[in-house]
């Protein structure tokens, strides 16, 4: 017998401009009259339209869901029943042709065509997109809380919240021909379970999203999203029942910028300037293509591209690319989003220089992408340290801490976390290196202390970017540096005039002068150490719920000693600002560093100053002994202590703590403790301070308290945010 | 490179002293505990003692409790075992070895130097 | 007679696999980490595995340790000539107060 044929729906969505009408204020209101009567006509006509051409025989429904400007603007969807094999065959671009094709045919006949009777259509303005039972579904939810806004030239539009007894609310917003809408979401609460999905259609068409975002999001408070043009749906589900709005939903049209760019660089290395896509920090648009091609000064040198959080990958398959699509000499790499910095060396092998194309491939975007570009010397890309090929960063070697995953950089190491003399190869512990006494067979230890010398991992770089041999030489009262950088800033880590950490002992008043203790409504969270006179560092998982987000709910003390009594010397203070490291990881405990303004600067006094922070180079050598300090749990899942308490601990190699946690232990942790456990860190010493006396007597911050298994476990030592990995991004901040 | 150099061993006659040192270099000196362990010849390792790096603790084995004192001078980067009222029993090759705090793992050893106690 | 108990001597031809067993107590094994020292005649010990089944840098993969209670065991894969030594395993004994040894095993490569 015959096989009967399968049908299948296929769902369109789309929009057509009528030429003899004018968009009223009314036809905003669903409920209104004027929507009601004008969605009849406009109904009829596209039935009738879809009728008159071949599409007539599958035609099913369809529907007139909105109006917008230009003069009158309909917005609709319907669906044709077709047969499966013709499927492909129906495409968005075929059904919109034929339609136009209808259109044009009827443009300047006098017959009478049913669906001219009212509406004057005009064929250019027709756009047919591909949609799904589902994206109907989808607008079909919100359209009991329906918004259309058109937004003028030069008008900045802020959206009316959503309405909080609808489930789903859709702002269908409409800007000038030309322009691209700009739309920023700006999250107004600490907690909240709202999502918002961005569409570069009028309505909520997945294949057309630019991007969703969810729950008030720490990590983008402020969302800026591009659309391709001046058309642009926002569709909001809601959380949590909430009275107050978690969010502020602003709208402007922006003209298209170009994103091309023809540079010719100098003759020196280093980052040289920044390309980025249009409107950044704004997410790129899903139109999005950057052209910009640079021209490299001499074969020498390659031409750098350094990321901040993107990284270019290969892509097997073709494959599109979801994140950006880059073209740098005719390779096609991949973009990818990632909490790490990276680099994109590119070679230069002719003086004709390097095209770098950007396309958003897909209608899916993100954050914007910003890109430092300099030059690197093709023959020595990284003086004095390594580099990494995983990333293309130039990275510390031999220094005991495996910063290239691939752990090249710590590999045929003649001397590791030592200095090696120039006349054997031994190797010599690094406190002994410039310190007066030669140690080498012929004291190649102690010479060219007193000059600049080429930069490597353990020497220390000036202000005026030279670099000096003797190691950890800030603040020990002597300059070595030409221009005194290194005795710059100095006034830090000394402890007070003083006469419970698992293990540890009480400590005294000014003791451990920048010690600080952050608490909610009176309850000690968290450590932490003053650094500055308006900032304190501490740990970021300690912010880690949403609950804990907000900065008006903490207080800072320093100069406190016992948490249930105050005494002269403690002050307190409001935070201001709250910044976690943008590449911080929470399941990781990667980049585990926050940094708290606080609302007045300190006065110093015995019992508050701050610590000195390391510089990139200073290196904490394995086997030093410092110390920890805080009110944490004297025992594992006990109550906190109520005196500050200290306790020493030793600096563990590298490579011996990530083999005891298998391998989590990353650059930026560094492992302190006992094999036989006893002495550690315990809940409540989070984001304290583990520091480590100089030969000077100033007192340097190592690390935080970050993570570990269980408090004063044998086998396990604490694991402690690595401050010199992190010192860039202080620096940056807290100048 | 770490290395331990032992010196100070002889034969002695029982009831006597005697006093070994062990010479460090190639690391920092002062952030280590060190210990010393012993092997009589032909027989199994023996720990002897252990002085914590800033010399807050000493243990000794029972054995040796009341005779032997072990010292350390971290200006020198020398380690010291005291050895008095030798017995014959402590004849042996003594190494000196270092160990990270609170792990009681000897990572690196010295040659070792034999004391001999014989009359 | 040592605190750890460890098998004299054990023997296995080329390339084959040995095991060096150690048991021991609470106090000891039990509670705490241990390591296993290697002693080619003539010369000082070399740490082989510390923290119950870690490698020092170094050391070949061919030796593992593992641990399981108070028995501590010391294995090694692809036997050599050089391998041929003495294999002490040690521990903290928390009630003694010190470093405990095992009698030492000597290992022949036939």
């Known amino acids: 017998g015959y096989k009967a044929e399968v049908m299948v729906s296929q769902v369109y969505s789309g929009s057509l401009r009528v030429l003899n009408r004018h968009f009223s204020q009314d036809l905003t209101r669903r409920e209104s009259s004027a929507f009601r009567s004008e969605t009849a006509k406009a109904q009829k006509m596209l039935k009738e339209l879809i009728t008159s051409t071949r599409l007539g025989t599958y035609y099913n429904s369809s529907s007139v869901y909105s109006f917008g400007e230009g003069p009158l603007t309909c917005f609709f969807w319907f669906i044709l029943q077709i047969p499966e094999h013709r499927r492909l065959m129906l495409s968005p671009e075929v059904v919109q042709a034929l339609l136009v094709e209808e259109l044009l045919s009827t443009v300047n006949s006098s017959a009478a065509v049913p669906y001219r009777a009212e509406y004057e259509v005009d064929p250019e303005g027709l756009v047919i997109l591909e949609a799904s039972v589902k994206d109907i579904a989808a607008l079909n939810s919100t359209l009991g809380c329906y918004r259309y806004s058109y937004v003028g030239q030069g008008q900045v539009l802020r959206l009316k919240g959503p309405d909080h007894l609808a489930s789903s609310c859709l702002w269908h917003l409409q800007g000038p021909k030309d322009l691209m809408l700009k739309l920023r979401l700006e999250w107004t609460l600490a907690e909240c379970r709202d999502r918002l999905a961005m569409y570069d259609v009028a309505g909520p068409l997945e294949k057309r999203l630019i991007t969703s975002v969810y729950g008030c999001s720490r990590q983008e408070p402020v969302v800026e999203v591009l659309a391709s043009g001046a058309i642009m749906a926002v569709v909001w589900k809601k959380g949590l029942h909430s009275y107050y709005d978690p969010f502020v939903l602003s709208v402007q049209p922006v003209v298209f910028q170009a994103c091309e760019v023809n540079l010719t660089l100098d003759n020196r290395l280093d980052s040289q300037g920044v390309l980025s896509t249009p409107y950044f920090p704004s997410y790129y648009s899903p139109q999005t293509h950057c052209s910009w091609h640079l021209t490299v000064p001499s074969l020498d040198y390659g031409l750098a591209l350094w990321f901040d959080a993107y990284a270019l990958r290969r892509q097997k398959y073709d494959l599109p690319c979801t994140q950006g699509q880059w073209t740098i000499q005719n390779r096609r790499l991949c973009g990818l989003r990632i909490l790490q910095p990276y680099a994109e060396r590119i070679p230069v092998v002719a003086t004709a220089g390097i095209t770098i194309n950007f396309t958003s491939q897909i209608s899916l975007t993100g954050p914007g992408v910003r890109v430092h570009y300099g030059l690197y010397n093709q023959s020595d890309p990284c003086p004095g340290e390594f580099l990494c090929s995983v990333n293309g960063l130039c990275v510390p070697a031999c220094d005991g801490v495996k910063d290239c995953p691939n752990g090249l950089d710590e590999r045929n190491c003649v001397c590791r976390a030592t200095f090696q003399c120039k006349e054997d190869s031994t190797c010599i512990s690094l406190p002994k290196v410039c310190d007066g006494q030669p140690d080498c067979l012929n004291g190649s230890d102690e010479e060219q202390c007193q000059e600049g010398v080429p930069c490597g991992t353990f020497t220390f770089q000036c202000e005026d970017r030279s670099c000096v041999k003797k190691p950890n030489p800030q603040c020990d009262g002597r300059p070595d540096c030409r221009d005194g950088s290194d005795e710059e800033h100095c006034d830090c880590g000394l402890q007070g005039p003083s006469s419970r950490i698992v293990g540890g002992a009480v400590s005294s008043e000014g003791e451990w002068p920048w010690q600080a203790s952050l608490q909610v409504r009176g309850r000690h969270i968290c450590g932490g150490a003053l650094i500055a006179d308006r900032w304190v560092i501490t740990a970021a998982h300690c912010f880690q719920e949403d609950s804990m987000a907000s900065t008006v709910l903490w207080t800072v003390f320093l100069g406190k000693v016992w948490q249930n009594s105050r005494w002269p010397g403690e002050v307190s203070f409001k935070v201001s600002r709250l910044l976690l490291h943008p590449y911080h990881e929470e399941d990781s405990h990667d980049y585990d560093v926050a940094l708290l303004q606080l609302d007045h600067p300190v006065v110093r006094s015995a019992a508050v100053r701050p610590v000195c922070l390391p510089a990139r180079s200073h290196f904490f050598e394995p086997g030093l002994h410092c110390w920890i300090t805080g009110w944490g749990a004297l025992r594992e899942g006990g109550p906190i202590s109520n005196a500050l308490q200290k306790v020493d601990v030793q600096l563990i190699p590298q490579d011996l703590c990530s083999e005891v946690y298998r391998y989590q232990v990353t650059p930026r942790m560094l492992c302190a403790g006992y094999r036989k456990g006893k002495k550690d860190a315990c809940q409540g010493d989070s984001g304290g301070p583990l520091v480590c006396k100089a030969l000077s007597g100033r007192w340097f911050l190592a690390g935080l308290v970050s993570w570990g298994l269980g408090c004063g476990r044998p086998n396990y030592f604490g694991v402690y945010t690595r401050i010199t990995g992190v010192i860039s991004w202080i620096q940056q901040v807290v100048t | 490179q770490v290395h331990l150099v032992e010196s100070g061993g002889a034969v002695v006659q029982p009831g006597r002293s005697l006093r070994l040192s062990c010479a460090a270099s190639?690391?920092?000196?002062?952030?280590?505990?060190m210990h010393w362990v012993r092997q009589t010849p032909g027989k199994g390792l023996e720990w002897v003692t252990i002085i914590r790096y800033d010399e807050t603790n000493i243990y000794y084995t029972e054995s040796v409790k009341g005779r032997f004192t072990t010292s350390r001078d971290n200006s020198k980067n020398t380690l010291y075992l005291q050895m008095n009222s030798l017995r014959v029993e402590d004849t042996a090759v003594y190494y000196c070895?270092?160990?990270?705090?609170?792990?009681?793992?000897?990572?690196?050893w010295g040659q070792g130097a034999l004391v001999t106690v014989s009359s | 007679q040592s605190v750890l108990t460890q098998p004299p001597s054990v023997s296995e031809a080329p390339r084959q696999r040995v095991t060096i067993s150690c048991s021991g107590g609470?106090?000891?094994?039990?509670?705490?980490?241990v390591n296993w020292y290697q002693q080619v005649p003539g010369k000082a010990p070399k740490l082989l595995i510390h923290?119950?089944?870690l490698l020092p840098s170094g050391v070949s993969d061919r030796f593992s340790g593992s641990k399981s209670g108070t028995s501590a065991s010391l294995a090694i894969s692809g036997l050599q000539s050089e391998d041929e030594a003495d294999y002490y395993c040690?521990?903290?004994?928390?009630?003694?107060?010190?470093?405990?040894f095992g009698g030492g095993t000597k290992l022949t490569v036939l």
């Open positions: 040690a521990a903290w004994d928390d009630s003694l107060n010190g470093v405990v």
């Open positions: 923290y119950d089944d």
């Open positions: 190639g690391f920092t000196f002062s952030n280590f505990d």
């Open positions: 070895a270092r160990g990270w705090t609170g792990s009681y793992v000897f990572d690196y």
């Open positions: 609470s106090s000891n094994i039990g509670n705490n980490a």
